[in-house]
């Protein structure tokens, strides 16, 4: 039979690969069927019988076409500072991302391993660079003529209001106070906010390599304590 119409298991022609969704079993020396995502190989193929696949058990998954003897365990439940953006199913691992107001301090292949609260800039300091999904807020001292009177991870330094007659000059943490009933020019009341980082998950559509490479493993590295940056408060 030509390779196109052979049924698994079959011996491939010398120099030929197996076809779509098949793998070469070294022991049987045959091309055999892979198991689909959500399944694993319960019984490996032989020269006369094809792979027997079985569904993954609860809390386990396989994301790729495979011939693994056991499904992979889903990651542990998301912690209180995280939200579950993808549930554990037979075909995909659980994905945890950081909740609003937090950023990912230690990422993993998909999602986040360790979240940390976004730095808050104390009065006299404003946000120089807003936080993102994977980076903390950077604070900077308010330049002359600007101020911030809040402890916030989103507020930037705002210009002092300009008075006809100044009662109390503004400083880095306080606006100017005017004696006249209305200032010449005033910023709109209320703090200026920077947008919170939005936790989005890019679709994982990486193509499937020939599964003959060893699986990668990640290790959680201990994180030593780090002093807060100037102008920030630990929360």
């Amino acid at each position: 039979l030509p390779a196109q119409v052979a049924f698994t298991p079959y011996a491939p022609e010398p120099g030929s690969t197996c076809r779509l969704r098949e793998y070469y079993d070294q022991t049987a020396q045959m091309c055999c069927s892979k198991c689909s995502p959500g399944q694993h190989a319960k019984v490996f193929c032989t020269k006369t019988s094809d792979t027997v696949c079985d569904s993954c058990e609860d809390s386990t998954y396989t994301q790729l076409w495979n011939w693994v003897p056991e499904c992979l365990s889903c990651g542990s439940r998301c912690s209180s500072d995280q939200v579950e953006t993808q549930a554990c199913t037979r075909e995909q691992n659980r994905i945890c991302t950081c909740r609003p107001g937090w950023y990912c301090a230690l990422s993993k292949q998909e999602g986040c391993r360790l979240c940390a609260p976004l730095r808050k800039c104390r009065p006299g300091f404003g946000v120089a660079r807003p936080g993102t999904e994977t980076s903390d807020v950077v604070c900077k001292p308010c330049a002359p003529g600007t101020f911030s009177n809040t402890t916030s991870s989103t507020d930037i330094c705002r210009p002092h209001q300009i008075c006809n007659v100044v009662a109390i000059p503004g400083n880095a943490s306080m606006d100017a106070v005017c004696t006249s009933t209305s200032p010449t020019r005033s910023m709109a009341p209320g703090a200026v906010h920077l947008p919170q980082p939005v936790s989005t998950r890019s679709q994982h559509t990486q193509p499937t390599p020939e599964p003959s490479t060893a699986p990668s493993t990640s290790f959680l590295l201990p994180m030593g304590p780090s002093p807060p940056a100037e102008g920030s408060t630990g929360d």
Epitope: A3, Q4, P12, G15, S16, T17, R19, L20, R21, K34, L64, W65, P207, T208, P209, E210, S212, T213
Partner: antibody, heavy 119, light 107 residues
Framework: QVQLVQSGAEVKKPGASVKVSCKAS????????INWVRQATGQGLEWIGW????????QYAQKFQGRVTMTRNTSISTAYMELSSLRSEDTAVYYC????????????WGQGTTVTVSS | DIQMTQSPSSLSASVGDRVTITCRAS??????LNWYQQKPGKAPKLLIY???KLHSGVPSRFSGSGSGTDFTLTISSLQPEDFATYYC?????????FGGGTKLEIK
Amino acid sequence: QVQLVQSGAEVKKPGASVKVSCKASGYTFITYDINWVRQATGQGLEWIGWIYPRDGNTQYAQKFQGRVTMTRNTSISTAYMELSSLRSEDTAVYYCARGDRDYGYFDVWGQGTTVTVSS
Amino acid sequence: DIQMTQSPSSLSASVGDRVTITCRASQDISNYLNWYQQKPGKAPKLLIYFKSKLHSGVPSRFSGSGSGTDFTLTISSLQPEDFATYYCQQGNTLPLTFGGGTKLEIK
């Protein structure tokens, strides 16, 4: 970034052979099939076959069996497609494309190599 | 070999329109249907694989549906950069085969 860069245009006489190269970069060359697909001017796409760079094994479309030879040089992450006994109907743009053998798609393509067969 | 038939072969539409292209397989191909976009003088680009999975970087206005033998590619709101030729391709059985293409032109 992941890319495939092909050799330049070729003009051949009927009966001759042509060898097109495809250099991969930005990923592990040996872990993905390299497919070859051709497209005659104003026509659709036609799959020729694939090579698995890890072991050099191939899978050819029946139509091209006996006329096509796919090889690779893993040290320079390059795949080759040689087509022999050329005829005018082989005039086309030849593309190499990285393939996925589970879903049968091509996710990264070379820029194409124009092969003209003319006497 | 599995024959893939696309319709229409050409289509005129305007920016903002919703467009549907269909692809029919000569036999059941399960969900192993992929879609590509090709612009003149360029290589095809993968848009959708396994019937409805969006390839990375592809805008969400592209979507795929269908099963068995009949499939559709939908562009929810045409953008100027979407005018191109679209090809379907089956990934179910060797040899891998493509549809004849649908040329999407500006009305």
